[in-house]
């Protein structure tokens, strides 16, 4: 039975040209995390493999940095970066947990962070 929950940074906003940290945290399970995939819609951004480390997809190599932790830092944000981001935790023996973050990239200088929320 999957008992874990994914806590994410929820709905967040950031300024165009700035940077943002996408962060997820898996809790309430003793399952071993084997790999975390970061995806934007159906596009792979990055992989963090427990044994092998990080892989950043080539199309994001100049503006995505690994970390902190299992999170991902997006840099040089554009309005086109607005959308859904998913952290997909592959665990043993539980299976797969998925967290969702919605990022809005704003033209204005007013960019507020949303509240944290949980996805069972």
């Amino acid at each position: 039975m999957m008992t874990g929950t994914i806590e994410t940074t929820g709905n967040i906003s950031a300024e165009k040209g700035g940077s943002i940290i996408l962060q997820c945290h898996l809790s309430s399970t003793t399952a071993q995390v084997t790999q975390v995939n970061w995806e934007q819609q159906d596009q792979l951004l990055a992989i963090c493999n427990a044994d092998l480390g990080w892989h950043i997809s080539p199309s994001f190599k100049d503006r995505v940095a690994p970390g902190p932790g299992l999170g991902l830092t997006l840099q040089s944000l554009t309005v086109n970066d607005t959308g859904e981001y998913f952290c997909i935790y592959h665990t043993y023996p539980d299976g797969t947990y998925t967290g969702r973050i919605f990022l809005e990239v704003l033209e204005s200088s007013v960019a507020e962070h949303g509240a944290r929320f949980q996805i069972p």
Partner: antibody, heavy 121, light 106 residues
Framework: EVQLVESGGGLVKPGGSLRLSCAAS????????MSWVRQAPGKGLEWVGR??????????DYAAPVKGRFTISRDDSKNTLYLQMNSLKTEDTAVYCC????????????WGQGTLVTVSS | PYELTQAPSVSVSPGQAASITCSGD??????ACWYQQKPGQSPVLVIY???KRPSGIPERFSGSNSGNTATLTISGTQAMDEADYYC?????????FGGGTKLTVL
């Protein structure tokens, strides 16, 4: 030590089929994205296709000349990669090698010696 | 289909720097890899992810990739570097090899 050993090559008639295997050792095979690459006699390298790890969907991608005829699969429990080749053509004659896609800094292993596939009547 | 273009041959004197280029549309948006192949031997990865060197590859091998061009540079070229060099464009959906460049050390 990372090692890849290909087998299953041989002589086959045009229109025939063949299944190649690649036995992997020295690394956690299930984590790796794996490709097949071929080299015709006296020619350059040609990518055939790849299969991603199960944790990245286990999906496959193929080069245009083999799409619909070749199928890549993997058995992580046996640390083995496969290439099923159907409807073979004379232009498929080549040495076939399996390779580790260079995603990760600590997993960029050497190529095997390959296995020769000859398609001829 | 995506294509990569390499010069068929490059010549260099021992001790000099050799540059081998590879061009393709928006190649800088992909990862460039470089393979060295000597006669009768399997290819060896010398550069991956544009500029990274696998363990065991000498420091004289370096790589860069931006715009439409990837470049493999061998500083202080040695006779043992004479080989065919293949560039490779790598991304999450496809892989393509260039036609290869024969490096001759005069």
């Amino acid at each position: 030590e990372v090692q890849l050993v290909e087998s299953g090559g041989g002589l086959v008639k045009p229109g025939g089929s063949l299944r190649l295997s690649c036995a992997a050792s020295g690394f956690t095979f299930s984590n790796a994205w794996m490709s097949w690459v071929r080299q015709a006699p006296g020619k350059g390298l040609e990518w055939v296709g790849r299969i991603k790890s199960k944790t990245n969907g286990g999906t496959t991608d193929y080069a245009a000349p083999v799409k619909g005829r070749f199928t890549i699969s993997r058995d992580d429990s046996k640390n083995t990669l496969y290439l099923q080749m159907n409807s073979l053509k004379t232009e498929d004659t080549a040495v076939y090698c399996c390779t580790i896609d260079p995603l990760y800094d600590i997993l960029t292993g050497p190529w095997g010696q390959g296995t020769l596939v000859t398609v001829s009547s | 289909p995506y294509e990569l273009t390499q010069a068929p041959s490059v010549s260099v004197s021992p001790g000099q720097a050799a540059s081998i280029t590879c061009s393709g549309d928006k190649l800088g948006d992909k990862y460039a890899c470089w393979y060295q192949q000597k006669p009768g031997q399997s290819p060896v990865l010398v550069i991956y992810q544009d500029s990274k060197r696998p363990s065991g590859i000498p420091e004289r091998f370096s790589g860069s990739n931006s715009g439409n061009t990837a470049t493999l540079t061998i500083s202080g070229t040695q006779a043992m570097d004479e080989a065919d060099y293949y560039c490779q464009a790598w991304d999450s959906s496809t892989v393509v090899f260039g036609g290869g460049t024969k490096l001759t050390v005069l």
